[in-house]
């Protein structure tokens, strides 16, 4: 349905408030270093222009594409060259190359100051003084730090952010009310950003087919009662939504996501029995709820898959006629029967099935060749099962902090070239799999753990892609999306690594560590642990444990001392000497 004016169409569909918010997010995700005020000015200009197009769709420039309109607007920024360097060269290009150029310059790790939370009273005053600016600032700060954040979902976060301040700034104990809510939003926001980053990486690095396969598997687990045709329709629509958001087309993305939620709710009888509550909510909550809805119960009587996918004499005929449809049906049928498998495992099984058919359908006796195909699945299923069992046992034995430390050591030995902050961030997140997933019964552990690990390892991949330093990381990240985790798991100690020169400065600590939160203190200790392993990659667990125990005792002792700074200086020298001796440095 072609519209004379795309900008007018989206303005009318979304309404002014959502339109302005989405344009702000889009601009902040592209120009991550621009001041807030500059972005607000650009957004207001675009909004005023959109209103003229709503009044008269034939008005000048109203027929231009959104990429053209937004790109032209971004290219009016005076400081583009000095702030962004070569990104300014994008402005010399025509659409669609210009937008592709902007996308390529999105920075997953922008050099921006950490967001420091002001005092509660200060925040409440700012909220009451100018609620609109306060909420816009939230969108801006999140969007520029997370350039792939799922825009319609960010609107949902902003709505919850506003609700938290509305409620808590009137409460007797503002801090007790507000801070837990802000912590929850922060943690959920980071998780949401990382999950979306994987979807965009899947689309951009591995293509639409890879994303569609992921979506078939996940939606079939979630909606096992839905017919294959229904799941296929949802997959097609969902792919369009995420392609748009990952491509910076945030207005189209939000509009199409709303349409998809509407369709799902209108057809819930043929999709899932679990959607009723979601579909009674307002739009933003509804879309979020549908995205998180629990798996429906499996139909009572699903037959074995052998008949259609192994025993049938028509397997090769059906495969040859429509390969992706047949493989899609295989994936759908397997996934709806296995909510206990991770999506990546299901995709590995489908890939094995595809490879077998490719080989066997060209053989003299195809049926004889593929008859034992599902015997090949056994090791693929058992590998993640065993890995999760071992790691959950380790987590239960060590607790989260020490489990993270074990992973820090493991991953630093595998890929010691990776920067220390990245190793700390990724290993800490990998370690959270324990508290997130090990509490679940066996039937829910694998989908929880392995699909979460896919999200975390994608963080490593996108951060490493910015400044590649390890061929092993590049190999694991680029060869196969579904085999990333097994690829990293299989890495042994990097024998080619030349240990880092010892630098006492790295292990010199000051009294300011005492004022840090427990989490920040842990990060400092874990940073030191990574550096230790980089100096001495062959250090044993026992050696590292001894040094880390000494280090913890040293911090505790000096933080209790009257003259903390002197304690850190004197005891620090002793600790460094003792650590060098213990590790044979």
């Amino acid at each position: 349905d072609a519209h004379k004016s795309e900008v007018a169409h989206r303005f009318k569909d979304l309404g002014e408030e959502n339109f302005k918010a989405l344009v702000l997010i889009a601009f902040a995700q592209y120009l991550q270093q621009c001041p807030f005020e500059d972005h607000v000015k650009l957004v207001n200009e675009v909004t005023e222009f959109a209103k003229t197009c709503v009044a008269d769709e034939s008005a000048e420039n109203c027929d231009k594409s959104l990429h053209t309109l937004f790109g032209d607007k971004l290219c009016t920024v005076a400081t583009l060259r000095e702030t962004y360097g070569e990104m300014a060269d994008c402005c010399a290009k025509q659409e669609p190359e210009r937008n592709e150029c902007f996308l390529q310059h999105k920075d997953d790790n922008p050099n921006l100051p950490r967001l420091v939370r002001p005092e509660v009273d200060v925040m409440c005053t700012a909220f009451h003084d100018n609620e609109e600016t306060f909420l816009k600032k939230y969108l801006y700060e999140i969007a520029r730090r997370h350039p792939y954040f799922y825009a319609p979902e960010l609107l949902f976060f902003a709505k919850r952010y506003k609700a938290a301040f509305t409620e808590c700034c009137q409460a007797a104990d503002k801090a007790a009310c507000l801070l837990p809510k802000l912590d929850e939003l922060r943690d959920e926001g980071k998780a949401s950003s990382a999950k979306q980053r994987l979807k965009c990486a899947s689309l951009q690095k591995f293509g639409e087919r890879a994303f569609k396969a992921w979506a078939v598997a996940r939606l079939s687990q979630r909606f096992p009662k839905a017919e294959f045709a229904e799941v296929s329709k949802l997959v097609t629509d969902l792919t369009k939504v995420h392609t748009e958001c990952c491509h910076g087309d945030l207005l189209e993305c939000a509009d199409d996501r709303a349409d998809l939620a509407k369709y799902i709710c209108e057809n819930q009888d043929s999709i899932s029995s679990k959607l009723k509550e979601c579909c009674e909510k307002p739009l933003l909550e509804k879309s979020h709820c549908i995205a998180e809805v629990e798996n429906d119960e499996m139909p009572a009587d699903l037959p074995s898959l052998a008949a259609d996918f192994v025993e049938s004499k028509d397997v090769c005929k059906n495969y040859a006629e429509a390969k992706d449809v047949f493989l899609g049906m295989f994936l759908y049928e397997y996934a709806r029967r296995h909510p206990d498998y991770s999506v990546v495992l299901l995709l590995r099984l489908a890939k094995t099935y595809e490879t077998t058919l490719e080989k066997c359908c060209a053989a003299a006796d195809p049926h004889e060749c593929y008859a034992k195909v599902f015997d090949e699945f056994k090791p693929l299923v058992e590998e993640p099962q065993n890995l999760i069992k071992q790691n959950c046992e380790l987590f239960e034995q060590l607790g989260e902090y020490k489990f993270q430390n074990a992973l820090l050591v493991r991953y630093t030995k595998k890929v010691p070239q990776v920067s220390t902050p990245t190793l700390v961030e990724v290993s800490r997140n990998l370690g959270k799999v324990g508290s997130k997933c090990c509490k679940h019964p066996e039937a829910k552990r694998m989908p929880c753990a392995e699909d979460y690990l896919s999200v975390v390892l994608n963080q490593l991949c996108v951060l490493h892609e910015k400044t590649p330093v390890s061929d092993r990381v590049t190999k694991c990240c680029t060869e196969s999306l579904v085999n990333r985790r097994p690829c990293f798991s299989a890495l042994e100690v990097d024998e080619t690594y030349v240990p880092k020169e010892f630098n006492a400065e790295t292990f010199t600590f000051h009294a300011d560590i005492c004022t840090l939160s427990e989490k920040e203190r842990q990060i400092k200790k874990q940073t030191a642990l990574v550096e230790l392993v980089k100096h001495k990659p062959k250090a044993t667990k026992e050696q590292l444990k001894a040094v880390m125990d000494d280090f913890a005792a040293f911090v505790e002792k000096c933080c209790k001392a009257d003259d903390k700074e002197t304690c850190f200086a004197e005891e620090g020298k002793k600790l460094v000497a003792a650590s060098q001796a213990a590790l044979g440095l």
Epitope: M298, A300, D301, L302, P303, S304, L305, A306, E333, Y334, R337, H338, P339, D340, Y341, F374, D375, F377, K378, V381, E382, E442, A443
Partner: nanobody, 124 residues
Framework: EVQLVESGGGVVQPGGSLRLSCAAS????????MGWFRRAPGKEREFVAA????????YYADSVKGRFTISRDNSKNTAYLQMNSLRPEDTALYYC?????????????????WGQGTLVTVSS
Amino acid sequence: EVQLVESGGGVVQPGGSLRLSCAASGSTISSYVMGWFRRAPGKEREFVAAISRSGGYTYYADSVKGRFTISRDNSKNTAYLQMNSLRPEDTALYYCAAGRYSAWYSQSYEYDYWGQGTLVTVSS
């Protein structure tokens, strides 16, 4: 947790019949695919038969098709294997298994719970 206990095994002559039972406790079996496997002396465990949750679908290994019948009574929380026209090569330890999620009924990795087994000996 589902506990499975097999019974009904024994010694029988070639051509004879036996009916194995698999009684489940700890959970209702109506949400599980039930299967029978066997291990002959010195051989690997092999699939025999399986039945879907409601009993609407049954699936057999080629070697037992037409001779063995799998059934279930969800109200009694029990699965059965009726074995007719028994042969010496059917001699094995027979295991009952329950799988909450199952795509390939014939694959042991698809089953979550296993019994200890009941011995069937076919000999003249």
